[in-house]
Amino acid sequence: NKILVKQSPMLVAYDNAVNLSCKYSYNLFSREFRASLHKGLDSAVEVCVVYGNYSQQLQVYSKTGFNCDGKLGNESVTFYLQNLYVNQTDIYFCKIEVMYPPPYLDNEKSNGTIIHVKGKHLCPSPLFPGPSKP
């Protein structure tokens, strides 16, 4: 039995930040679980992890180069990514594992979310201001 995951197909980070919501066909209340966010088509780079259990506060881990926070819903984990760079534009996959109570469960691979990080286009100040009017 596998948990199904729903993600938005695409998100645009205009201000170098984005909320990626991973919605599960499973209620995480009173469960020990590990939710993670993976970068790249092959999911090779795990960038954020949210660990939760029934007795502790939610724990969030960010890989170096990523600024990540996590929020738990009954059937979702939302990853809040900040300070994203244009070169971090990629496809991101949500993964979930539930360890307790048994049985161990994980998810069917989701379709992923393309996060498109838009660079900040600041209007450059003119190098040579025009002649000043009298």
Epitope: E32, S36, E46, V49, Y61, K63, M99
Partner: nanobody, 124 residues
Framework: EVQLVESGGGEVQPGGSLRLSCAAS????????MGWFRQAPGKEREFVAA????????DYAESVKDRFTISRDNAKNTVYLQMSSLRAEDTAIYYC?????????????????WGQGTLVTVKP
């Protein structure tokens, strides 16, 4: 809950070698990392080396690169620290740590569980 038990510490002469082991037990997920930190008397606990479950990510403190090697046996849930060319400044209590992060984290705060520590003494 995760339990960690270290072994392998002892006294060795400068230039000598030791291998530390750390066995983990408890509920494990498909990816996590384990690391070694050390604490010399009167000093902060500092990062030494770490490796993730998939063994595709390892990291070392600058001071131990080319002298220490971290490895793991996933079948035994055990991480090893092979220490060679030991110096007096490597004398410390070595602690094994466990983190739910899936990468070789050097951040002490990322580690949720710690072993009891094993003493390594390097002296002539």
């Amino acid at each position: 809950e995760v339990q960690l038990v270290e072994s392998g510490g002892g006294e060795v002469q400068p230039g000598g070698s030791l291998r530390l082991s750390c066995a983990a037990s408890g509920r494990m997920f498909s990816n996590y990392a384990m690391g070694w930190f050390r604490q010399a008397p009167g000093k902060e606990r500092e990062f030494v080396a770490a490796i993730n479950y998939r063994r595709d990510d390892a990291d070392y403190a600058e001071s131990v690169k080319d002298r220490f090697t971290i490895s793991r046996d996933n079948a035994k849930n055990t991480v090893y620290l092979q220490m060679s060319s030991l110096r007096a400044e490597d004398t410390a209590i070595y602690y094994c740590g466990f983190t739910y992060a899936g990468w070789a984290s050097s951040r002490r705060d990322d580690y949720n569980y710690w072993g009891q520590g094993t003493l390594v003494t390097v002296k002539p």
